[in-house]
Interface confidence: low
């Protein structure tokens, strides 16, 4: 999906009002210094690409993020403020339903959400300082 047509300010507002708090809730009890940020992004469309990938694509050791509150709100924000996004996600949604029935918080998931927090922060302050 090409995220360049999204309404970035509206997505930013959704992040600041709710998504950020849900991410903090998920990470509660975890030290902010526990994980190193290894994923970055260079501008807002790129950040959304990385955010979508980390939030909705199951990875080894963490297949359950899509059912979390922050993920559902992220999906809603992208569906509302990125034209045509919903249509591209129908097949992906079916795959996610099959992938996991229950929510499990693993260390790998905590690390992944820590990366997401960094990506969202970069989304709000875009532009890579070095390519």
């Amino acid at each position: 999906y090409d995220f360049t047509n999204c309404d970035f300010e509206k997505i930013k507002a959704a992040y600041l009002s709710t998504i950020s708090k849900d991410l903090i809730t998920y990470m509660s009890g975890t030290k902010s210094t526990e994980f190193n940020n290894t994923v970055s992004c260079s501008n807002r469309p790129h950040c959304l690409t990385e955010i979508q990938s980390l939030t909705f694509n199951p990875t080894a050791g963490c297949a359950s993020l899509a059912k979390e509150m922050f993920a559902m709100k992220t999906k809603a924000a992208l569906a509302i403020w990125c034209p045509g996004y919903s249509e591209t996600q129908i097949n992906a949604t079916q795959a996610m339903k099959k992938a996991r029935k229950s929510k499990v918080t693993t260390n790998k998931c905590l690390e992944q959400v820590s990366q997401l927090q960094g990506l969202w922060r970069r989304f709000n302050r875009p532009l890579l300082k070095q390519q």
């Epitope: 360049t4 260079s42 790129h46 302050r125 532009l127 300082k129």
Partner: antibody, heavy 117, light 107 residues
Framework: EVQLVQSGAEVKKPGASVKVSCKAS????????MHWVRQAPGQGLEWMGM????????TLIQKFKDRVTMTVDKSTSTAYMELSSLRSEDTAVYYC??????????WGQGTTVTVSS | DIQMTQSPSSLSASVGDRVTITCRAS??????LAWYQQKPGKSPQLLVY???TLAEGVPSRFSGSVSGTQFTLTISSLQPEDFATYYC?????????FGGGTKVEIK
């Protein structure tokens, strides 16, 4: 209304320094990055570097690393670009431009710097 | 560094003509390209960003497109106020670089 107002034209001798200012208004100064771009007479645009007004972190292209200093004064929403050890090839119009995603939606009016002995 | 090769460097056209300017990136920059218009003695003005998004207040006769690493700015029907120099610029990452410019002159 967003405005970037730059300081006036400067005439300098080779070896001297020049400090160009860029006063921002009409938006939250620390939200946008400030970039500096120059244009030699009859030539194209050349990106010099950028500064993040929120934390003053700067990125400069290699050719300017030793001679350019970019600073901001958050209290007055002003960005500065100082170029030292001036030479004749630094004669150009210097622009400040604000950006969030790397494209420039507002530019200053430009400051002409002439280096001549 | 990413090199931006802009062509032609100049062109002559008449009012009402369709004008096409191209810019090629030396590597993949996705849709991270902007187009600017500059008139003599003035600052550049943003026309298009993210390769195809028209900036606020820019007339609809301007449009941008992308195919791989080649980017195109099209003016569908040239107007007297469009005679100027046009620059492309990638905004994929540091260092930002501009194309050499295309001067659109009156035939």
């Amino acid at each position: 209304e967003v405005q970037l107002v730059q300081s006036g034209a400067e005439v300098k001798k080779p070896g001297a320094s020049v400090k160009v200012s860029c006063k921002a208004s009409g938006y939250t100064f620390t939200t946008y990055w400030m970039h500096w771009v120059r244009q030699a007479p009859g030539q194209g645009l050349e990106w010099m570097g950028m500064i993040d007004p929120s934390d003053s972190e700067t990125t400069l292209i290699q050719k300017f690393k030793d001679r350019v200093t970019m600073t901001v004064d958050k209290s007055t929403s002003t960005a500065y670009m100082e170029l030292s050890s001036l030479r004749s090839e630094d004669t150009a119009v210097y622009y400040c431009a604000r950006t969030l995603d790397g494209y420039y939606d507002y530019w200053g009016q430009g400051t002409t710097v002439t280096v001549s002995s | 560094d990413i090199q931006m090769t802009q062509s032609p460097s100049s062109l002559s056209a008449s009012v009402g003509d369709r004008v096409t300017i191209t810019c090629r990136a030396s590597e993949n920059i996705y849709s991270y390209l902007a187009w600017y218009q500059q008139k003599p003695g003035k600052s550049p003005q943003l026309l298009v960003y993210f390769a195809k998004t028209l900036a606020e207040g820019v007339p609809s006769r301007f449009s941008g497109s992308v195919s791989g690493t080649q980017f195109t700015l099209t003016i569908s029907s040239l107007q007297p106020e469009d005679f100027a120099t046009y620059y492309c610029q990638h905004h994929y990452g540091t260092p930002w670089t501009f194309g050499g410019g295309t001067k659109v002159e009156i035939k």
